[in-house]
Amino acid sequence: QLPPGKPEIFKCRSPNKETFTCWWRPGTDGGLPTNYSLTYHREGETLMHECPDYITGGPNSCHFGKQYTSMWRTYIMMVNATNQMGSSFSDELYVDVTYIVQPDPPLELAVEVKQPEDRKPYLWIKWSPPTLIDLKTGWFTLLYEIRLKPEKAAEWEIHFAGQQTEFKILSLHPGQKYLVQVRCKPDHGYWSAWSPATFIQIPSDFTMND
């Protein structure tokens, strides 16, 4: 029977800069029941606080609700593991909410084949930003990426869409069924997961050439 091993805070993520969650990996438990607590203070302050919500983020997590999430402030946090034989502390982690945003995937992905009479046909792709993100405040710039491939192909073709929420693709294989997905990331932060795939059948008369 031993004191617990050193825990590690390995990830913090925010869906929208308004709340965030951090997760830790326990060290060895020393063969005894072990309690974990996450404590932190904000840069420029010395008053320590404890994790307000150990439940929402699942096991070995701390969720910071709106009233605990401060923009433009760095959080300095650590996890304490304690059993009957002693305690151990994780290294301190410095967290700035601005840099840990990972949005939900974009919504309402719509894909349509457009075949104008006077121009080349194209695939028209449209989507909406995730609901948790408020783009009107100006705090967020979301960038988008599209990927698509024929259903049976191994390789994805990736297109960067910038800030726009619609995109045209001209070069497609006629008669093929395509999978299309979109994801987003803030200017600072992490790519979202890919949206659920939307399928589109490309007509056999879809011409790639002039």
Epitope: T39, G44, L47, H49, E50, Y54, K66, Q67, Y68
Partner: antibody, heavy 118, light 106 residues
Framework: EVQLVESGGGLVQPGGSLRLSCAAS????????MNWVRQAPGKGLEWVAY????????YYADSVKGRFTISRDNSKNTLYLQMNSLRAEDTAVYYC???????????WGQGTLVTVSS | DIQMTQSPSSLSASVGDRVTITCRAS?????LHWYQQKPGKAPKLWIY???KLASGVPSRFSGSGSGNDYTLTISSLQPEDFATYYC?????????FGQGTKVEIK
């Protein structure tokens, strides 16, 4: 509606003990840091003690350190202050208050009077 | 310890007057908070994070400042504003109040 209701105050002799309680309702008690603040008759406010949401962090004012113990029972939504070795200068109204995020003392109880006198 | 010094400790003013209370911290703060207390009542949060008015606080109140120096201003004093005001720092242990400023009727 957030409510904090203190109880347990009264008259006690110097050197005696008293345990104050604060019953909380109307919010998720286990998510909030809690405090005791006191006010001697005709004097200003003095912070006494702080306890974090899960009791991992506890702070005391120097004037009560070693004599007072703050604790909480999240299953009962109750905050406590065990006061030992009481002195005349501990005579005050004791208020239970909460930390809302980083906003200190957004709600206060009505207070309970502790009188230390022989 | 961070000492909080309020001035003045008391003031007399008339309804309609502009009133300013100052609070100086012995160490630089990021935020400062203000509380209002009336005789026989529990204090109330009045201004938090230096300049944000608590729920129900009239807009004639304002807070400002940074670093070591902070002010609470009442633009036009009303009868219900006569009370004692306390500044407070919750950034560092031990948590500390100013000694209070009593606003009385002239």
């Amino acid at each position: 509606e957030v409510q904090l209701v203190e109880s347990g105050g009264g008259l006690v002799q110097p050197g005696g003990s008293l345990r104050l309680s604060c019953a909380a309702s109307g919010f998720t008690f286990s998510s909030f840091g809690m405090n005791w603040v006191r006010q001697a008759p005709g004097k200003g406010l003095e912070w006494v003690a702080y306890i974090s949401s899960g009791s991992s962090i506890i702070y005391y004012a120097d004037s009560v350190k070693g004599r007072f113990t703050i604790s909480r029972d999240n299953s009962k939504n109750t905050l406590y202050l065990q006061m030992n070795s009481l002195r005349a200068e501990d005579t005050a109204v004791y208020y239970c208050t909460r930390f809302y995020g980083y906003i200190p003392f957004d709600y206060w109880g009505q207070g309970t009077l502790v009188t230390v006198s022989s | 310890d961070i000492q909080m010094t309020q001035s003045p400790s008391s003031l007399s003013a008339s309804v309609g007057d502009r009133v300013t209370i100052t609070c100086r911290a012995s160490s630089s703060l990021i935020y400062l908070h203000w509380y209002q207390q009336k005789p026989g009542k529990a204090p109330k949060l009045w201004i938090y994070d230096t300049s944000k008015l608590a729920s129900g606080v009239p807009s004639r109140f304002s807070g400002s400042g940074s670093g070591n120096d902070y002010t609470l201003t009442i633009s036009s004093l009303q009868p219900e504003d006569f009370a004692t005001y306390y500044c407070f720092q919750g950034s560092g242990y031990p948590l500390t109040f100013g000694q209070g400023t009593k606003v009385e009727i002239k």
